[in-house]
């Protein structure tokens, strides 16, 4: 997150981290039920660990943390690497969470966000647009949902109904390491960090997020059948 601020501890209890090896963060994720996470489909890896209830970027033990393995990764069937359409994936964890003040699921928004809606995006991604600086703790950033027209003007030929744009203040954006993390609007999960320009935080190049309102049925059906 570029030019965000430290999240309040436990204010994003649905925020997850996907880790390679013992503790190498590569993507964010969102807890949506006691045993299921959402993340971006482009975050798919054959082996990874899941960390919930953690505030710090460092692997130091925190009393609220819970660690899991992913036992099932189900990317949306419409996702095709390296494209960005349908960029979401369900992850089933090896066990259910212990519900606590640090670890809680978030409800997915059924209604699509409208222009001007204020939202919060969070993650442990890089805090500098062109090189890798990492935050000490989880970062939060207020962003504004942009009109479809403005979104399409920013990225001609790249935007479809499975995406929405948010942000657009120069110097404020999600960035590398934030993929798959939550965009929460009015207390409900509206999107996932998906893509944007490189470097991040460029003028008139907002972050692009997976438009989860388009996938509520697929998410529910997939969880129920697995």
């Amino acid at each position: 997150i570029v030019n965000g601020s430290d999240c309040q501890k436990d204010a994003q209890p649905w925020q997850g981290a996907l880790l390679l090896g013992p503790n190498k963060l590569y993507c964010g994720a969102v807890l949506i039920s006691p045993q299921w996470l959402l993340t971006a489909a482009h975050c798919r890896k054959p082996v990874f660990r899941i960390r919930l209830g953690h505030h710090s970027m460092s692997p130091v033990y925190e009393s609220g943390q819970q660690m899991f393995q992913g036992i099932k990764s189900i990317p949306h069937p419409g996702y095709s690497h390296p494209g960005h359409s349908n960029d979401l994936m369900l992850i089933k964890m090896n066990r259910k969470i212990r519900d606590s003040h640090s670890v809680k699921p978030v409800e997915i928004a059924c209604d699509c966000a409208t222009e001007g809606t204020r939202c919060m995006v969070s993650g442990w991604g890089t805090t500098s647009s062109s090189h890798n600086n990492f935050p000490k703790v989880l970062q939060c950033l207020n962003i504004t949902v942009l009109s479809e027209e403005r979104c399409k003007n920013s990225y001609p030929g790249q935007i479809d109904k499975t995406m929405f744009c948010a942000g657009d203040e120069e110097g404020r954006d999600s960035c590398q390491g934030d993929s798959g993390g939550p965009v929460v609007c009015n207390g409900k999960l509206q999107g996932l960090v998906s893509w944007g320009d490189f470097p991040c935080a460029q003028r008139n190049r907002p972050g692009v997020y997976t438009n989860l309102c388009e996938f509520v049925k697929w998410i529910k059906d997939t969880m129920n059948s697995n």
């Epitope: 390679l20 190498k24 963060l25 590569y26 993507c27 971006a40 482009h42 975050c43 390296p82 494209g83 960005h84 991604g125 890089t126 062109s130 090189h131 890798n132 920013s154 990225y155 001609p156 030929g157 790249q158 999600s174 960035c175 590398q176 390491g177 934030d178 993929s179 798959g180 960090v193 998906s194 893509w195 944007g196 320009d197 490189f198 470097p199 991040c200 460029q202 190049r205 972050g207 692009v208």
Partner: antibody, heavy 124, light 107 residues
């Protein structure tokens, strides 16, 4: 399959501007999943990254060359270009264009497609 | 800038032998941001490994990468005749830089 082809003058005079173009064929340059870069290799030496550009025109330059480098993109021609000003003999090299993939995960995918390179000599 | 130092400069081995190439960074680099390339004379570099350990498309499994922090290794388990070339490591953790290369030559 995607191919990259560098073109431009093979000889440039000192203090002038080196101009090269990379033409992308077999695919579109207008993809938000990729960036397009320039790398050079002086005779008998190693590789040096010059800079890169996204299809939307956002650039990222090597700090040591930044004051002399301009990279631009022309999506209508499926091309991107390099301009290096105030050249000296030290800029004599094989210049490569290449493609890299990016997203917002914390992961570097490397540069997976390269042009065959074009030799540029700086001499009066 | 992050300086990458490759060693040895030249490695003289026979086909069938194991090659171990080292890349050391002047400061810590996330392994997610390290790549290896192969270059043969008169050709462009070819991506072998990205994310320190993931093989690029079409790369045989005799090539493997490992390491973290400041020390990274490219291993070729059994050298084939076509593997004799120059190998470069590259970091993109900050402004991208390449190592000076290791030449793997036939003994």
């Amino acid at each position: 399959q995607l191919q990259l082809q560098e073109s431009g003058p093979g000889l440039v005079k000192p203090s002038e501007t080196l101009s090269l173009t990379c033409t992308v064929s077999g695919g579109s340059i207008s993809s938000s999943s990729y960036y397009w870069g320039w790398i050079r290799q002086p005779p008998g030496k190693g590789l040096e990254w010059i800079g890169s550009i996204s299809y939307s025109g956002s650039t990222y330059y090597n700090p040591s060359l930044k004051s002399r480098v301009t990279i631009s993109v022309d999506t209508s021609k499926n091309q991107f270009s390099l301009k290096l000003s105030s050249v000296t003999a030290a800029d004599t090299a094989v210049y490569y264009c290449a493609r890299g993939e990016y997203d917002r995960s914390y992961y570097y995918y490397g540069m997976d497609v390269w042009g065959q390179g074009t030799t540029v000599t700086v001499s009066s | 800038e992050i300086v990458l130092t490759q060693s040895p400069g030249t490695l003289s081995l026979s086909p069938g032998e194991r090659a171990t190439l080292s890349c050391r960074a002047s400061q810590s680099v996330s392994s997610s941001y390290l790549a290896w390339y192969q270059q043969k004379p008169g050709q462009a570099p070819r991506l072998l490994i990205y994310g320190a350990s993931s093989r690029a498309t079409g790369i045989p499994d005799r090539f493997s990468g490992s390491g973290s922090g400041t020390d990274f290794t490219l291993t070729i388990s059994r050298l084939e005749p076509e593997d004799f070339a120059v190998y470069y490591c590259q970091q993109a953790f900050s402004s991208p830089t390449f190592g000076g290369g290791t030449k793997v030559e036939i003994k």
